[in-house]
């Protein structure tokens, strides 16, 4: 997990200022109002590995 301004979060995650860490975009299904979910809308999801 990276601090903002150094490197982006890994694919499928987005930076949360509230929690001070990268958070899973998948959690936006249950918690759409989380601060980091705005960043998820612009980023592609992590690919499935079937």
């Amino acid at each position: 997990e990276q601090a903002p301004g150094t490197a982006p979060c890994s694919r499928g995650s987005s930076w949360s200022a509230d929690l001070d860490k990268c958070m899973d975009c998948a959690s936006c299904r249950a918690r759409a109002h989380s601060d980091f979910c705005l960043g998820c809308a612009a980023a592609p999801p992590a690919p499935f590995r079937l």
């Epitope: 899973d24 998948a26 249950a30």
Partner: antibody, heavy 119, light 111 residues
Framework: EVKLQQSGGGLVQPGGSMKLSCVAS????????MNWVRQSPEQGLEWIAE??????????HYAESVKGRFTISRDDSKNSVYLQMNNLRPEDTGIYYC??????????WGQGTTLTVSS | DTVLTQSPASLVVSLGQRATISCRAS??????????IHWYQQKPGQPPKFLIK???NRDSGVPARFSGSGSGTDFTLNIHPVEEDDTAIYYC?????????FGAGTKLELQ
């Protein structure tokens, strides 16, 4: 370091009551949904209760098996979550864990506390 | 409620070999983007330890020997190569809806 420190538990007679407590440290408690999960040889791992956030007036959810008998509550000022258990039954016997989740997975668990309901 | 069925109930594997654990959901627990299945490891006298989230994403600090896959209703946890320390019970859990339920567990033992 994330820590969930549990207290309470012990032996109680059928029909009796017990309150479990869990104090959290090392993470932003008020942002996390707090849960109780119990484990027994008969039922395996069984989620029993969850309390969500102040911003939504602390909504709660319960397993059908404990609805109306158990009450989950939290005190964000004390980083604590509680489980008040009333009208206890022998089938409530097990190890009780508090666990936190942001939305989906239980990433941190307490050490567990044993409840025995027996006469 | 979504029921998770794990198989096998127990598994004996030789050191260095592959352990494969299956978790089948009674309904789909995937969207087009994510699968809402998570894996845990539990050793005697300890609480479950979170291993893998969203079917395939390892938690930080979890060795690359652990991998998860699957979507829809069928999911797999693979451990390869198996090490001594991997002796434990492994559980899957879904977060598709309330209640979140767990599989009955798979006990992994070393030969």
């Amino acid at each position: 370091e994330v820590k969930l420190q549990q207290s309470g538990g012990g032996l109680v007679q059928p029909g009796g009551s017990m309150k479990l407590s869990c104090v959290a440290s090392g993470f932003t408690f008020s942002y996390y949904w707090m849960n109780w999960v119990r484990q027994s040889p008969e039922q395996g791992l069984e989620w029993i209760a969850e309390i969500r956030l102040q911003s939504n007036d602390y909504p709660t959810h319960y397993a059908e098996s404990v609805k109306g008998r158990f009450t989950i509550s939290r005190d964000d000022s004390k980083n604590s979550v509680y489980l008040q258990m009333n009208n206890l039954r022998p089938e409530d016997t097990g190890i009780y864990y508090c666990a936190c989740r942001y939305a989906d997975y239980f990433d941190h668990w307490g050490q567990g506390t044993t409840l025995t309901v027996s006469s | 409620d979504t029921v998770l069925t794990q198989s096998p109930a127990s598994l004996v594997v030789s050191l260095g070999q592959r352990a494969t654990i299956s978790c089948r959901a009674s309904q789909s627990v995937s969207t087009s983007d994510y699968s809402y299945i998570h894996w845990y490891q539990q050793k005697p006298g300890q609480p479950p330890k979170f291993l893998i989230k969203y079917a395939s994403n390892r938690d930080s600090g979890v060795p690359a020997r652990f991998s998860g896959s699957g979507s829809g209703t069928d999911f797999t946890l693979n451990i390869h190569p198996v090490e001594e320390d991997d002796t434990a019970i492994y559980y899957c859990q879904h977060s598709w809806e309330i209640p979140p339920t767990f599989g009955a567990g798979t006990k992994l033992e070393l030969q």
